[in-house]
């Protein structure tokens, strides 16, 4: 039985041109995380964090994606096209795979606030 829980930053908004932290956290399990994959709404891989090998940022995102904090991801120079779903996939053993979802809305407005509350999807 998979006992763990993925907590994510949930639904967040950020300003165009700004940056945002995408954060997932796996809790309530002793499972060993072998790899965390970060995917965009169109299922393209942004980055991989492997326990043995460290971070790999995919070439298409190298200029705009920074690893961390922790197993999270920082998206920079946001454009309106960045609006959409983001997924963190935790590959673990013995539990198997855990998946978390974050929805990012990029706003033109200068009053856009980056809400970073944690919630369980």
């Amino acid at each position: 039985m998979m006992t763990g829980t993925i907590e994510t930053t949930g639904n967040i908004s950020a300003k165009k041109g700004g940056s945002v932290i995408l954060q997932c956290h796996l809790s309530s399990t002793m499972a060993q995380v072998t790899q965390v994959n970060w995917e965009q709404h169109d299922h393209s891989l942004l980055a991989i964090r492997n326990a043995e090998l460290g971070w790999h940022i995919y070439p298409a995102f190298k200029d705009r994606v920074a690893p961390g904090p922790g197993l999270g991801l920082t998206l920079q120079s946001l454009t309106m096209n960045d609006t959409g779903e983001y997924f963190c996939t935790y590959h673990t053993y013995p539990d198997g795979t855990y998946r978390g979802r974050i929805f990012l809305e990029v706003l033109e407005s200068s009053v856009a606030e980056h809400s970073a509350r944690f919630q369980i999807p």
Epitope: S27, A31, Q32, E52, P94
Partner: antibody, heavy 118, light 112 residues
Framework: EVKLVESGGGLVQPGGSLKLSCVAS????????MSWVRQTPEKRLELVAE????????YYPDTVKGRFTISRDNAKNTLFLQMNSLKSEDTAMYYC???????????WGQGTLVTVSA | DVLMTQTPLSLPVSLGDQASISCRSS???????????LEWYLQKPGQSPKLLIY???NRFSGVPDRFSGSGSGTDFTLKISRVEAEDLGIYYC?????????FGGGTKLEIK
């Protein structure tokens, strides 16, 4: 090279306390679940404590629950085992161990001996 | 708890012989993920245990190919095709498909 070095063992009286340490090197300590395993004088192996990579989750078998506390300092690459209310049956060699490649105890330290005796 | 029973307790062999150690679990150790998390360790005299086999049949890095693991469900076997002097020690099976994770009692491989 993965290296795990335990320390802190020794002779302690029943009811006493001891704190074991395990210093890790050669890998990203904060990425791994870590465990303490003990081996009794009769050579039986028993998992006594586990802690998740962040330190947020811990596990203990009933034999040590409420007496032992596992913790970690990821900034110092160090794993700890605080042992209280020690009993003669806690006498054992204590090893820290790390998973890897789909295995639970891929790497072991050299061990530190704990003797509980009056 | 999953009880891991190893047989025999002691296994006297001649160098060059094949050795076989059995490990039986009190219930299936197939994890919900479909994997069977059964491992074999060797503890040589005066040393800490070392991983030989993981997930039933996968040799850990640096482990000679004379060691092989097999089995499924509740019955598992470690075979050493040609025993060498450096293989002597205590062999343990271990499962982590279920909590609490449990070891077998050990099998001592010794010279006949």
């Amino acid at each position: 090279e993965v290296k795990l070095v335990e320390s802190g063992g020794g002779l302690v009286q029943p009811g006493g306390s001891l704190k074991l340490s395990c210093v890790a090197s050669g890998f990203t300590f904060s990425s791994y679940t870590m465990s303490w395993v003990r081996q009794t004088p009769e050579k039986r192996l028993e998992l006594v404590a586990e802690i998740s990579s962040s330190g947020g989750s811990t596990y203990y078998p009933d034999t040590v629950k409420g007496r032992f506390t596992i913790s970690r300092d990821n900034a110092k690459n160090t794993l700890f085992l605080q042992m209280n209310s020690l009993k003669s049956e806690d006498t054992a060699m204590y090893y820290c161990a790390r998973p890897g490649l789909g295995a639970w105890f891929a790497y072991w330290g050299q061990g530190t001996l704990v003797t509980v005796s009056a | 708890d999953v009880l891991m029973t190893q047989t025999p307790l002691s296994l006297p062999v001649s160098l060059g012989d094949q050795a076989s150690i059995s490990c039986r679990s009190s219930q299936s150790i197939v994890h919900n993920s479909g994997n069977t998390y059964l491992e074999w360790y060797l503890q040589k005299p005066g040393q800490s245990p070392k991983l030989l086999i993981y997930k039933v049949s996968n040799r850990f890095s640096g482990v000679p190919d004379r060691f092989s693991g097999s089995g499924s469900g509740t019955d598992f076997t470690l075979k050493i095709s040609r025993v060498e002097a450096e293989d002597l020690g205590i062999y343990y099976c271990f499962q982590f498909s279920h909590v609490p994770r449990t070891f077998g009692g050990g099998t001592k491989l010794e010279i006949k």
